[in-house]
């Protein structure tokens, strides 16, 4: 059994304008250092599953085991925290599922369920069969450890019965939990034996104990809440994109770069070109050309469309993404075949060329200018 469990966002937030590049918030898994993590890729009918962490390919090693749709990390450390993705490659398409792993000393897990089942938790016992409090639905209490992203709603439940009907009170870290202990207070739904805290913040972290009692006895149950904090991060590119492509002379082709980013990213499509018959400048750095970049009024920069291609269009195309926080890049190759040859589907792989990570770039003029790889500067 995994030592953590996914927490779903149950808050209802006002509708916001769609964000062009943001993939929906990934699910959060939390584990304590030293524990073993096991995650199942929630994608169906996968022929091949590949894994990435923070956009970088994840392969097996002495602590990472990849078996079928399962990823297992032995002896987790805080360095294992990050944005993970599993990509299922099928015969006709591929799909990616994202999730966050947070390895923290404040271990937590669990999920918030809606009160759809409502009042069946409220057990009313008639007659003279006096009875001390007892739990009526222990399944809803199994997840003692709850990891919740900041600003979400948390619900703890202690469904109980007894005769007379027991009362319920809540403690935080062993002391009476008062409304004034948190901004916005909290709600207690006695009918549902639940405690609800909206818009949780880091100061809400701690142990929450429900005490259920009547004159014949008392029972209690403790939950641990960890509030997972979010900060903006550099862009992360979906593994496998852009994908290698091939087409015939005169054909059309599209490269797609899918970005996960909190902060809105700038996207640049860059191609290796020749200048005076050479692909490299005197300093050994490649000549590059910015084909397209995102700007305030640009069209969908995630897609680079090439129409009526010629043999000169063949080569490597780089998707370089940067936001206020940092950068990421991946590339793909275009093969242009003579017209009489029918193109075959290229194997979809993604290269992250080392020189993009190591070199400086320069781009300080128009979009179509060729520049030597020294510094790329943003000009909107």
């Amino acid at each position: 059994r995994p030592s953590f469990s996914l927490v779903e966002d149950t808050t209802l937030e006002p509708e916001e304008p769609p964000t062009k590049y943001q993939i929906s918030q990934p699910e959060v898994y939390v584990a304590a250092p030293g524990e073993s993590l096991e995650v199942r890729c929630l994608l169906k009918d996968a022929a091949v599953i590949s894994w990435t962490k923070d956009g970088v390919h994840l392969g097996p090693n002495n602590r990472t085991v990849l078996i079928g749709e399962y990823l297992q990390i032995k002896g987790a450390t805080p360095r294992d925290s990050g944005l993970y993705a599993c990509t299922a490659t099928r015969t006709v398409d591929s799909e990616t599922w994202y999730f966050m792993v947070n390895v923290t000393d404040a271990i937590s897990s669990g999920d918030d369920e809606d009160d759809t089942d409502g009042a069946e938790d409220f057990v009313s016992e008639n007659g003279n069969n006096k009875r001390a409090p007892y739990w009526t639905n222990t399944e809803k209490m199994e997840k003692r450890l709850h990891a919740v992203p900041a600003a979400n709603t948390v619900k703890f439940r202690c469904p109980a019965g007894g005769n007379p009907t027991p009362t319920m009170r809540w403690l935080k870290n062993g002391k009476e939990f008062k409304q004034e202990h948190r901004i916005g207070g909290y709600k207690v739904r006695n009918q549902h034996w639940s405690l609800i805290m909206e818009s949780v913040v880091p100061s809400d972290k701690g142990n929450y104990t429900c005490v259920v009692e009547n004159e014949y006895g008392s029972i209690n149950h403790t939950y641990h809440l960890d509030v997972v904090e979010r900060s903006p991060h550099r862009p992360i590119l979906q593994a496998g994109l852009p994908a290698n492509a091939s087409t015939v002379v005169g054909g059309d082709v599209e490269f797609v770069c899918k970005v996960y980013s909190d902060a809105q990213p700038h996207i640049q499509w860059i191609k290796h070109v020749e200048k005076n018959g050479s692909k490299y400048g005197p300093d050994g750095l490649p000549y590059l050309k910015v084909l397209k970049h995102s700007g305030i009024n640009s069209s969908n920069a995630e897609v680079l469309a090439l129409f009526n291609v010629t043999e000169a269009d063949a080569g490597e195309y780089i998707c370089k993404v940067s936001n206020y926080i940092g950068q990421a890049n991946q590339s793909a190759w275009l093969t242009v075949l003579p017209k009489q040859q029918a193109p075959g589907r290229e194997k979809e792989i993604t290269a992250s060329p080392d020189y993009l990570e190591k070199l400086e770039f320069r781009h300080d003029s128009g979009l179509n200018d060729i520049f030597e790889a020294q510094k790329i500067e943003w000009h909107e």
Epitope: P232, D262, G295, I296, Y324, Q327, L356, E357, H379, E380
Partner: antibody
């Protein structure tokens, strides 16, 4: 913990050169832009430029282009802001910031004859 | 360059008050990239809100951000003694990443 530590206050004369530093620790230095921000006495914040230490990608505000140079040495997780010839109007507090969330304590530069 | 104009430039308020600061961009900031910072005298700025509406880790939930296009708002739902400071907006849509001129929140 994640932090940026800046070099100490400097008192210089007009025409002199200066290089101030910003050392990152507690995180992967190469994975985040380092931004430089100026705050003149009693005034607001002005974005000067940024560098991505992994590949030394730099960008400058037009107001500061040619006036300062931003550089980084990723081997020692340090970013720099330098002037070749200081002016009295360069007197200000200079902050470095990792992205938007982590800021250095600031370096006060005083240029006076 | 995109200019960011904050209003008011200063305001006086009491503990418990609801405070709203607005920032207007000189052109549409599509897609709504703005940060809000708090700065106290002699201290470095502190990030409160990123990308218009995301609360930064560790920032109290009384702070909230909203807006799109050209108009952005920072709201403090119930002003606390430690909130008296200067607040800045910043656009991070296109270079140069300009700041607003600041709004000083003082005790009434």
């Amino acid at each position: 913990q994640v932090q940026l530590v800046q070099s100490g206050a400097e008192v210089k004369k007009p025409g002199e050169s200066l290089k101030i530093s910003c050392k990152g620790s507690g995180y992967s230095f190469t994975n985040y832009y380092i931004h430089w921000v100026r705050q003149m006495p009693g005034k607001g914040l002005e974005w000067m430029g940024a560098i991505y230490p992994d590949n030394s990608d730099t960008t400058y505000s037009p107001s500061f282009q040619g006036q300062v140079t931003i550089s980084a040495d990723k081997s020692i997780s340090t970013a720099y802001l330098q002037w070749s010839s200081l002016k009295a109007s360069d007197t200000a507090m200079y902050y470095c910031a990792r992205g938007a969330d982590i800021w250095g304590q600031g370096t006060l530069v005083t240029v006076s004859s | 360059d995109i200019q960011m104009t904050q209003s008011p430039s200063s305001l006086s308020a009491s503990v418990g008050d609801r405070v709203t600061i607005t920032c207007r961009a000189s052109q549409d900031i599509d897609p709504y990239l703005s940060n809000w910072y708090q700065q106290k005298p002699g201290k470095a700025p502190k990030l409160l809100i990123y990308d218009a509406s995301n609360l930064q880790s560790g920032v109290p939930s009384r702070f909230s951000g909203s807006g799109s296009g050209t108009d952005f708002t920072l709201t403090i739902s119930s002003l606390q003694p430690e909130d008296f400071a200067t607040y800045y907006c910043q656009q991070t849509t296109s270079h140069p990443y300009t700041f607003g001129q600041g709004t000083k929140v003082e005790i009434k």
